[in-house]
Interface confidence: medium
């Protein structure tokens, strides 16, 4: 009952990052959804599509996937775009297993997030490197800016919009007023006025065994939204928790193995042992999910001598919610749960 089994580690070298400007747009805004959600086959999750628009039946192992048609996260699937170079537009749903990656001669472990350069944030998943651009939300030129244009500014990674008058002379600084919206065009002002935002952690991608949970945060020097990830394991897959429910009881909210253990990840072992708590199960179709938790840093040591650390969900307490409206998707209603204020650090 470790974080994950320890599979053999393979290296896979993806193609260098390509310009993705020619990718087709699978999302259309405003959203256009059918009047009623689809009925999914038993065991297939009903989820919100990747455009965050409509309900859809999640794509399954081997199905084609796009930014709109996403793979079933509750089955540990991800969209492998490696067969669609250089567009990375249409992928195939594949299983997340512990396979490492190599990019530009650097080895990354499965699940590891990294920045090969300042313009991309990448994650190694089962030998494939998936990258998201970090230069999406460029501060636009101020309103009525004369001759706006995009330029590369020394010391700044992403291109910036500048106004002709900003570029040709230093702008005088003046006391800042609160406008209907602040439209001053300096990059520094954007950073100084950055409103820190961190989203809640997403539900764990699997209902048992090793999964991934993500959140978006702009708490960084650039004030750019970046995705953070942490490992999570709500309950072991190889323990039938139902058998541990005491007679006359309907639920076992928390399951904690008696022995402490080391976590393993992609063949690497945690440097210290832990005695984690897991969420249990309920007999009456209710979902058992964490409501008190935090994120801990776990250090791993690999056989080849390399080490790394990973953020991991640490469960303190779970509860069985009132109902699971959709039996196909135990996470569908997480947003409507009462706010139990998960400890986010």
């Amino acid at each position: 009952t470790a974080l994950s089994p320890a599979p053999t580690t393979m290296d896979f070298t993806p193609a260098p990052l390509e310009d993705t400007s020619s990718r087709p747009q699978f999302c259309k805004w405003p959203c256009e959804c059918p009047p009623s959600p689809p009925r999914c086959p038993l065991g297939v999750s009903l989820i919100t599509d990747g455009c965050e628009c409509c309900k859809m039946c999640a794509q399954q192992l081997g199905d084609n996937c796009t930014e709109a048609a996403i793979c079933d996260p509750h089955r540990g699937l991800y969209c492998d775009y490696s067969g669609d170079r250089p567009r990375y537009a249409i992928g195939v749903c594949a299983q997340v297993v512990g396979v490492g990656c190599v990019l530009d001669g650097v080895r990354y472990n499965n699940g590891q997030s990294f920045q090969p350069n300042c313009k991309y944030n990448c994650t190694c998943i089962d030998g494939a490197v998936g990258c998201t651009p970090l230069c999406l939300r460029v501060r636009p030129p101020r309103l009525w800016c004369p001759h706006p244009r995009r330029v590369s500014i020394p010391g700044h990674c992403c291109e910036q919009w500048v106004c002709e008058d900003d570029a040709k002379r230093p702008r005088k600084t003046a006391p800042r007023d609160t406008g209907a919206f602040d439209a001053v065009g300096e990059v520094e002002a954007w950073h100084r006025n950055c409103i820190a935002y961190t989203s809640p952690w997403s539900p764990c991608s699997t209902s048992c065994g090793l999964g991934v949970s993500t959140r978006i945060s702009n708490v960084n020097a650039q004030c750019w939204p970046e995705q953070e990830s942490r490992l999570c394991n709500l309950r072991p897959c190889d323990v039938d928790i139902h058998t541990l429910i005491k007679a006359g009881k309907k639920c076992l909210a928390v399951y904690q193995p008696e022995a402490s253990m080391n976590f393993t990840l992609a063949g690497c072992i945690s440097t210290r042992s832990y005695q984690p708590k897991y969420c249990g199960v309920c007999m009456d179709n209710r979902c058992c999910i964490p409501y008190k938790s935090k994120t801990i840093d776990v250090s791993f040591q690999c056989p080849d001598g390399l080490g790394f650390s990973r953020q991991v969900l640490w469960i303190n307490a779970c509860f069985c919610n009132l109902s699971c409206r959709n039996p196909n998707d135990i996470f569908a209603d997480l947003e409507s749960y009462p706010d139990f204020s998960e400890i986010a650090n």
Partner: antibody, heavy 113, light 111 residues
Framework: QVQLVQSGREMKKPGASMKVSCKAS????????ISWVRQAPGQGLEWMGW????????HYAQKLQGRVTMTTDTSTSTAYLELRRLRSDDTAVYFC??????WGQGTLVTVSS | QSVLTQPPSVSGAPGQRVTISCTGT?????????VYWYQQLPGKPPKVLID???DRPSGVPDRVSGSKSDTSASLAITGLQAEDEADYYC???????????FGGGTKLTVL
């Protein structure tokens, strides 16, 4: 609070010139540039140009080049719009607006013989 | 004729959702220039609803949202109310004209 107060309505003859003022208050005048936008009766909005209140640099709409002049007086925190060789289709409400998203109340200029 | 094309009018019943489109070209919206949305009530100056960051300035209700893709943009208003009846304009920069351009405007009628 931030305010842009414009001069009163004007009646002009074709071929004449007009000059509309826009007095700013409630913020540092040189912080924001000023744009001028006009709206003919029952019609849409038309951007006329922009002036930096900081250094007087201007940026005019191509169709008005040669007829329009925008100026500022930092001592009185006032921006001015001058339009020459007026025609009947210049009849409109003229608005000033700063880079911060604030607008004046508008000045109606009627051009008629 | 504006280089940013908007439908002359749209209408919806109270509580409904309406969208107003703004179609441009490769020299304005398609070039990545920001788009602003304005509401103008009769006899009043325009008021910004969506700024160039696709954000709502303070005081604009979250019933209002903007989106942009390629050479078009749209403004969506949900939970339509009587006070939403007004003219709506999109605004962007056009590199060909070397200036800021408004869409032709859309009159929203709440039935």
């Amino acid at each position: 609070q931030v305010q842009l107060v414009q001069s009163g309505r004007e009646m002009k003859k074709p071929g004449a010139s007009m000059k509309v003022s826009c007095k700013a208050s409630g913020y540092t005048f040189t912080k924001y540039g000023i744009s001028w936008v006009r709206q003919a009766p029952g019609q849409g909005l038309e951007w006329m140009g922009w002036i930096s209140a900081d250094n007087g640099k201007t940026h005019y709409a191509q169709k008005l080049q040669g007829r329009v002049t925008m100026t500022t007086d930092t001592s009185t925190s006032t921006a001015y719009l001058e339009l020459r060789r007026l025609r009947s289709d210049d009849t409109a409400v003229y608005f000033c607006a700063n880079d911060g998203g604030y607008w004046g109340q508008g000045t109606l200029v009627t051009v008629s013989s | 004729q504006s280089v940013l094309t908007q439908p002359p009018s749209v209408s919806g019943a109270p509580g409904q959702r309406v969208t107003i489109s703004c179609t441009g070209t490769s020299s304005n919206l398609g070039a990545g220039f920001p788009v602003y949305w304005y509401q103008q009530l009769p006899g009043k100056p325009p008021k910004v609803l969506i700024d160039g960051n696709n954000d709502r300035p303070s005081g604009v209700p979250d019933r209002v949202s903007g989106s942009k893709s390629d050479t078009s943009a749209s403004l969506a208003i949900t939970g339509l109310q009587a006070e939403d009846e007004a003219d709506y304009y999109c605004l962007s920069y056009d590199s060909g004209l070397d200036g800021w351009v408004f869409g032709g405007g859309t009159k929203l009628t709440v039935l």
